[in-house]
């Protein structure tokens, strides 16, 4: 029986050449976190295995940096980046949690700087 | 270059223990880099066996692993494999295979020449 | 355990034909995809890893895309040295996983 919980950032906003963390956090579980990938809609941003360490896509090298912790920090942040983020823990043997992430890169400053894990 | 070598007995009977080992030349064998087991029944696909990493963890594919060790000697610059209780469906060639995860995820970028092992009696 | 389906299984082809191979998963696996070419009595060699990602020193004409669970690996020019069989593998989630191969020969 799965019984953990995912607390992510949940909607975050950022402002354009910024970064950003993203950040989630699995609790209310005994289970081994053998893996944490992070994704977007339709690719794979980084993974970091408990194993092996952390692999960024080829595509995100120059821009996504791993950490803190279990997190993400994506740098240089375009417009582009605005939308849906996941953070999807691989546990043993509870299977697999996901947790969800909204980014909004703003052109100017009228980002929020109130998010719990965003670098100022 | 890097290169990868697997050694070990070629024919192997019914219920024994397979041991191969896998030595990498070229190459500093304590750096970042894991090592991985993968075979290939005659005429047939391949099959990821398991890994060992820099620090020593092992993950190896549930279907094998209450058969399967995965070690290594860093002394020696050698990752060994051992099956226990095999039977002809472990017939296959055996490769050993570096692991860059850092650069390439779990796609492994060098291989070695493969070994054919054969189980009967 | 993730299945990774290859279509065709055999494909017969021509010097310098355009060739597609697919790769499909029986779970997401984002772009965690690798495709790797085996000719008779070698091992396998990479090309390709993160679904489109030229391995170093791999000639232009292999590419590959896609994301999710479905997959494609391309020859836009096949040359002599091509004809071999190519299997995908997913390295999204362990245990990984190869796809049962798509033999590519002459016609």
């Known amino acids: 029986m799965m019984t953990g919980t995912i607390e992510t950032t949940g909607n975050i906003s950022a402002e354009k050449g910024g970064s950003i963390i993203l950040q989630c956090h699995l609790s209310s579980t005994t289970a081994q976190v053998t893996q944490v990938n992070w994704e977007q809609q339709d690719q794979l941003l980084a993974i970091c295995n408990a194993d092996l360490g952390w692999h960024i896509s080829p595509s995100f090298k120059d821009r996504v940096a791993p950490g803190p912790g279990l997190g993400l920090t994506l740098q240089s942040l375009t417009v582009n980046d605005t939308g849906e983020y996941f953070c999807i823990y691989h546990t043993y043997p509870d299977g697999t949690y996901t947790g969800r992430i909204f980014l909004e890169v703003l052109e100017s400053s009228v980002a929020e700087h109130g998010a719990r894990f965003q670098i100022p | 270059d890097v290169q990868l070598q697997e050694s070990g007995p070629g024919l192997v009977k019914p219920s024994q223990t397979l041991s191969l080992t896998c030595t990498v030349s070229g190459h500093s064998f304590t750096s970042d880099y894991a090592w991985s087991w993968i075979r290939q029944p005659p005429g047939k696909g391949l099959e990821w066996i398991g890994y060992i990493s820099y620090s020593d963890s092992t993950n190896y594919n549930p279907s094998l692993k209450s058969r399967v060790t995965i070690s290594r000697d860093t002394s020696k610059n050698q990752f060994s494999l051992k099956l226990s209780s095999v039977t002809a469906a472990d017939t296959a060639v055996y490769y050993c295979?570096?692991?860059?995860?850092?650069?390439?995820?779990?796609?492994?970028?060098?291989w070695g020449q493969g070994t054919s092992v054969t189980v009967s009696s | 355990d993730i299945q990774m389906t290859q279509s065709p299984s055999s494909l017969s082809a021509s010097v310098g034909d355009r060739v597609t191979i697919t790769c499909r998963s029986s779970q997401h696996v984002s772009t965690a995809l690798a495709w790797y070419q085996q000719k008779p009595g070698k091992s396998p060699k990479l090309l390709i890893y993160?679904?489109?990602s030229r391995y170093s020193g791999v000639p232009d004409r292999f590419s590959g895309s896609g994301s999710g669970t479905d997959f494609t690996f391309t020859i836009s020019s096949l040359q002599p040295e091509d004809f071999a069989t190519y299997y995908c593998?997913?390295?999204?989630?362990?245990?990984?996983?190869f796809g049962g191969g798509t033999k590519l020969e002459i016609k």
């Open positions: 993160s679904a489109s």
């Open positions: 295979a570096r692991l860059d995860y850092g650069n390439y995820g779990g796609a492994m970028d060098y």
């Open positions: 593998q997913q390295h999204y989630i362990t245990p990984w996983t």
